[in-house]
């Protein structure tokens, strides 16, 4: 057991298995479920994280998967197909040959169909609105302090460039964080807004994906910011294609 083995961990993803068996004895970590090698200097893609989550023993799951008829709090949990880069494949199918198209954050964007369903491309989610309600506090948070703290959080914890945090809106007790990232804006090495939003969502739920770190301790000028509910809205570069039947339901 060497020091190298002690150091061989994945700080950004605890759902991995690591060993110093990479090229030249370097540390290499693989995601549970998929066995894909992951880059531990940055966030792991949501697709690989969902796959790892679904591969975990049933009793290790902290959340109950809701029925497919549930409209609110549907965790969107399914065992996804990921491409060699760890992104969601445009078409996802379940074990009963029901298929649907997803966007880059793995959210369904078409009606469900059968194996003949075609999803020509993975449509990018370029705008994410994170809607939070915080627990009552003595007074409202200072907007500019809140803005700075959330930008700092997304940079320092989730490695997201501040330019992708488009705005932070606040009307007590509601906080809205807008993330925007067009295909043309995202450079190699940039964290994807969808991955950052997913890590944030899991942190807020007390299910941190980081290795050995304490949970998220959000404070604005020393005052704890405790979130009591979260809603996340996804806007795609190409609008979703749902039938009128669904829209009028």
């Amino acid at each position: 057991h060497t020091a190298a083995q002690d150091n061989c961990t994945c700080p950004t993803n605890k759902m991995t298995v690591c060993s110093p068996d990479g090229p030249g004895g370097r540390c290499q970590c693989r995601a549970l479920g998929s066995g894909m090698a992951v880059d531990c200097s940055t966030l792991t893609s949501k697709c690989l994280l969902l796959k790892a989550r679904m591969s975990a023993p049933k009793n290790a799951r902290t959340l109950v998967r809701p029925s497919e008829h549930a409209l609110v709090d549907n965790d969107g949990l399914y065992d996804p197909d990921c491409d060699p880069e760890g992104r969601f494949k445009a078409r996802q199918c379940n074990q009963t040959s029901v298929c649907w198209c997803v966007n880059s954050v793995g959210v369904r964007r078409t009606d469900k169909g059968d194996l003949s369903l075609r999803c020509d491309e993975l449509v990018r989610t370029h705008h994410i609105l994170i809607d939070l309600r915080h627990r009552p506090t003595a007074g409202a948070f200072n907007h500019s302090d809140l803005d700075a703290e959330l930008r700092r959080l997304f940079r320092e914890r989730y490695r997201l460039h501040p330019k992708f945090v488009a705005a932070v809106h606040y009307e007590q007790p509601t906080i809205q964080i807008e993330l925007r990232q067009n295909t043309s804006q995202k450079a190699a090495g940039d964290v994807d807004i969808g991955d950052a939003a997913y890590y944030f969502e899991r942190d807020i739920k007390g299910e941190s994906l980081f290795q050995g770190r304490g949970g998220l301790d959000l404070r604005v000028r020393g005052e704890p910011l405790q979130v009591e509910r979260t809603l996340i809205y996804y806007l795609d570069e190409i609008p979703p294609k749902f039938s009128m039947k669904r829209l009028t339901a």
Epitope: N7, C8, P11, R26, D39, S41
Partner: antibody, heavy 122, light 109 residues
């Protein structure tokens, strides 16, 4: 714990070279970043590139270094910097340094090599 | 993104106090380091996280600030403090810009 650079010396303009950084007392297999930083004679410090030496080998490059400099880590004991199309402006002492955290955006350098001098001249 | 360090040179007597300022063109929170470099030597980390003293560094060195304005204060100057001091951040490394300040030469009279 120590770092040592090698590979410096006299290079002709338009030439190329490879610098190597080796560590002793620790493995380049942890959850941190290794950096190359340079300093022209009598001038300030400027970073060239870091590489993550844990799982993944992520890299970043200074704008001016893209295309001419390549950082790599093929083993758990060394990091290399390859430089091409060198000019007199690349004459400098080249340092390797270890970043103290896993987060590249919150990095500071807690261990430095003594540096190796590269002189580009005909 | 740019780090602006002032002054470029300062001279103070033994026992005096020197203040070096570093300004970031954008908010970098508390992600700033200070280094001391003597001729022919590599830089030495003095302070990280804007105000935390690195191991073995005397408490005469004090770092402060956050956001865009930072200060290094060296009190009770000693001859051994004669060196060039640099501030540094990697907060915007993905923009490909240099995160080091231009340096401040401290002369101890």
């Amino acid at each position: 714990q120590q770092l040592e650079e090698s590979g410096g010396g006299l290079v002709k303009p338009e030439g190329s070279l490879t610098l190597t950084c080796k560590g002793s007392g620790f493995d380049f297999s942890g959850t941190y970043w290794m950096w190359w930083v340079r300093q022209a004679p009598g001038k300030g410090l400027e970073w060239i590139a870091p590489i993550y030496v844990g799982s993944g080998s992520s890299t970043y490059y200074a704008s001016w270094a893209k295309g001419r400099f390549t950082i790599s880590s093929t083993s758990s004991t060394a990091v290399t910097l390859q430089a091409t199309s060198l000019t007199a402006a690349d004459t400098a002492t080249y340092f390797c340094a270890r970043g103290a955290t896993n987060n590249v955006f919150m990095n500071y350098f807690n261990l430095w090599g003594p540096g190796t001098l590269v002189t580009v001249s005909s | 993104f740019e780090m602006t360090q002032t002054p470029s040179s300062v001279s103070e007597p033994v026992g005096g106090t020197v203040t070096i300022k570093c300004q970031a063109s954008e908010d970098i929170s508390s992600n700033l380091g200070w280094y001391q470099q003597k001729p022919g030597q590599p830089p030495k980390l003095l302070i990280y996280g804007a105000s935390t003293l690195a191991s073995g560094v005397p408490s005469r060195f004090k770092g402060s600030g956050s956001g865009t304005e930072f200060t290094l204060t060296i009190s009770d100057l000693e001859p051994a403090d004669a060196a060039t001091y640099y501030c540094q951040t990697s907060y915007y490394i993905d923009d490909g810009v240099n995160g080091f300040g231009g340096g401040t030469e401290v002369v101890v009279k």
